[in-house]
Amino acid sequence: ITQQDLAPQQRAAPQQKRSSPSEGLCPPGHHISEDGRDCISCKYGQDYSTHWNDLLFCLRCTRCDSGEVELSPCTTTRNTVCQCEEGTFREEDSPEMCRKCRTGCPRGMVKVGDCTPWSDIECVHKESGTKHSGEVPAVEETVTSSPGTPASPCS
């Protein structure tokens, strides 16, 4: 996911003023004016705000990266929602990119969970049912696996 327009000082002139702040705050979809007297609408498809706020600038919409699909567009009150394309997933500890899901489990293991946009396939040992925590171990023969994935131990 990338941020649009990362040079805030180049930001275009604000849109028309809509309302006065309530107790110093502006409603979702707006930001506060430079003198604090007005609430200014965010620009649809460009920026947004999700809560009552005293932000001087609306938050810039994120754009979905290649390898992601847009589930819902950016509106003045909600950021873009992006999701990894089918066959790829994003891990919590590396959210900056979508990684290819493995195509199969290591020898002696069975698949118990499918590839989702949020998780790789899940494999367990046939006998013990112990989950495999990561990708294919280097020492073990594999059924099929995606290239370039580091080895990790079973749990």
């Epitope: 941020q3 805030p8 000082q9 001087l56 938050l59």
Partner: nanobody, 127 residues
Framework: EVQLLESGGGLVQPGGSLRLSCAAS????????MGWFRQAPGKGREFVSA????????YYADSVKGRFTISRDNSKNTLYLQMNSLRAEDTAVYYC?????????????????????WGQGTLVTVS
């Protein structure tokens, strides 16, 4: 508790320049997101400029864009505002402020009108 002390104000002719400084103490300066505001005689507080702790995100009010430049020196615990091409309407008390509840989204800092730690201000008169 952070303390802020502005300096550099004074009387200047239209078209002239001034450089304001804001020395901060009592906190880790490099962790502070900061800004400049001003208040003209008989008017309310107005946002001038803001800068993130790293200096990567910089914002200006439309009225000063292209004339004022905000910067910071984290090694000197000092925030600056270089003001060029000054106009009569820039006459105001200039305040340095700290955003103690900063908003970050996607790694980008967004300043608030309600910055909550203030210096005592320095008067700039353009006449």
């Amino acid at each position: 508790e952070v303390q802020l002390l502005e300096s550099g104000g004074g009387l200047v002719q239209p078209g002239g320049s001034l450089r304001l400084s804001c020395a901060a103490s009592g906190s880790t300066f490099s962790s502070l997101d900061m800004g400049w505001f001003r208040q003209a005689p008989g008017k309310g507080r107005e946002f001038v400029s803001a800068i993130s702790r790293s200096g990567d995100n910089i914002y200006y009010a439309d009225s000063v864009k292209g004339r004022f430049t905000i910067s910071r020196d984290n090694s000197k615990n000092t925030l600056y505002l270089q003001m060029n091409s000054l106009r009569a309407e820039d006459t105001a008390v200039y305040y340095c402020a700290v955003d103690s509840q900063p908003t970050y989204s996607g790694g980008v800092y967004y300043p608030r009108y309600g910055m909550d730690v203030w210096g005592q201000g320095t008067l700039v008169t353009v006449s």
